[in-house]
């Protein structure tokens, strides 16, 4: 997680702060949403379990031309230990349901807030 320092503050960021930043960004996306997020683009739903950060990134990275989630994509890359590129689905164990990006963000936010409240920062 030390690489997360690049986008928000100089030097390494504690895991709790890194998760805070991601939650803040997702809250901002959900609260500032006017038109359909990313023009209603659909992404693969993910299991919010182990490998969730990489899975979330693999799903969202296939949405292009959507500036609203670019910061989220960068943040998720800081939580994922391997490089993720479009079309890569190594962490997406199940690919059977597609949902709108807006719903994906809401589901991810709820889960991350629970992890934060539980003190699970890694």
């Amino acid at each position: 997680l030390t690489c997360l320092g690049g986008f928000a503050s100089p030097g390494p960021v504690p895991p709790s702060t890194a998760l805070r930043e991601l939650i803040e960004e997702l809250v901002n996306i959900t609260q500032n949403q006017k038109a359909p997020l990313c023009n209603g683009s659909m992404v693969w739903s993910i299991n919010l379990t182990a490998g969730m950060y990489c899975a979330a990134l693999e799903s969202l990275i296939n949405v292009s031309g959507c500036s609203a989630i670019e910061k989220t994509q960068r943040m998720l890359s800081g939580f994922c230990p391997h490089k993720v590129s479009a079309g890569q689905f190594s962490s997406l164990h199940v690919r059977d349901t597609k949902i709108e990006v807006a719903q994906f963000v809401k589901d991810l936010l709820l889960h991350l807030k629970k992890l934060f409240r539980e003190g699970q920062f890694n």
Epitope: P14, R20, E21, I23, K114, R117
Partner: antibody, heavy 123, light 107 residues
Framework: EVTLRESGPGLVKPTQTLTLTCTLY??????????VDWIRQPPGKGLEWLAH???????RYNPALKSRLTISKDTSKNQVVLKLTSVDPVDTATYYC???????????????WGQGTLVTVSS | DIQMTQSPSSLSASVGDRVTISCRAS??????LNWYQQKPGKAPKLLIF???KLHSGVPSRFSGSGSGTDYTLTISSLQPEDIATYYC?????????FGGGTKVEIK
């Protein structure tokens, strides 16, 4: 109107277990985003956070006291209970419960407090 | 744990004076800083959350500012009813920690 009311024994003997109850009015701990904290204040001193519990039963404790603390909730009675084991005279304090809300950013700000209950630990 | 240091520990000012209380965190708390007012014999009351957001019903003479590790509570014009002890509290992450308090008295 949101109010919280603490109740406790007043006097506890050293080594005993202290049980405190916080009754909630004007809001429910079964409602999403609601949480309750316990804080204590020794006479003439500052505030010390003890523990909190969320609507979904997520619990967190002050690491310095974690081995002695247990927080629980009874949603049907709209109450939160805090137990502190093996009490000592240094645990003498006014014990407060307070509400916190986690909607949007999780601010961990306690927006409504009970009036507090004074607990004296003495033989 | 995040340590919170308040200064001064006490101050005396005249009615109408501008009063400032400082709070320093041992690490960057990203504006997750809350202020409480505690009058003698009473429970604390939330004044300000997230550095500068006024809690409902709090007079506008109270304001908060700061970022990173340094935060300030300002009373723009001290009133007799403001006699109290003021505490800062970090809300970045548990364990939640409070400053030692600042006792405000009227000259």
């Amino acid at each position: 109107e949101v109010t919280l009311r603490e109740s406790g024994p007043g006097l506890v003997k050293p080594t005993q277990t202290l049980t405190l109850t916080c009754t909630l009015y004007g809001f429910s701990l079964s409602t999403s985003d609601m949480g309750v904290d316990w804080i204590r204040q020794p006479p003439g001193k500052g505030l010390e956070w003890l523990a909190h519990i969320w609507w979904d039963d997520v619990k967190r404790y002050n690491p310095a006291l974690k081995s002695r603390l247990t927080i629980s909730k009874d949603t049907s009675k709209n109450q939160v209970v805090l137990k502190l084991t093996s009490v000592d005279p240094v645990d003498t304090a006014t014990y407060y419960c307070a509400r916190t809300v986690s909607s949007g950013y999780i601010y961990y700000a306690m927006d409504y407090w009970g009036q507090g209950t004074l607990v004296t630990v003495s033989s | 744990d995040i340590q919170m240091t308040q200064s001064p520990s006490s101050l005396s000012a005249s009615v109408g004076d501008r009063v400032t209380i400082s709070c320093r965190a041992s690490q960057d708390i990203r504006n997750y800083l809350n202020w409480y007012q505690q009058k003698p014999g009473k429970a604390p009351k939330l004044l300000i959350f997230y550095t500068s957001k006024l809690h409902s019903g709090v007079p506008s003479r109270f304001s908060g500012s700061g970022s990173g590790t340094d935060y300030t509570l300002t009373i723009s014009s001290l009133q007799p009813e403001d006699i109290a002890t003021y505490y800062c509290q970090q809300g970045l992450t548990p364990p939640l920690t409070f400053g030692g308090g600042t006792k405000v008295e009227i000259k």
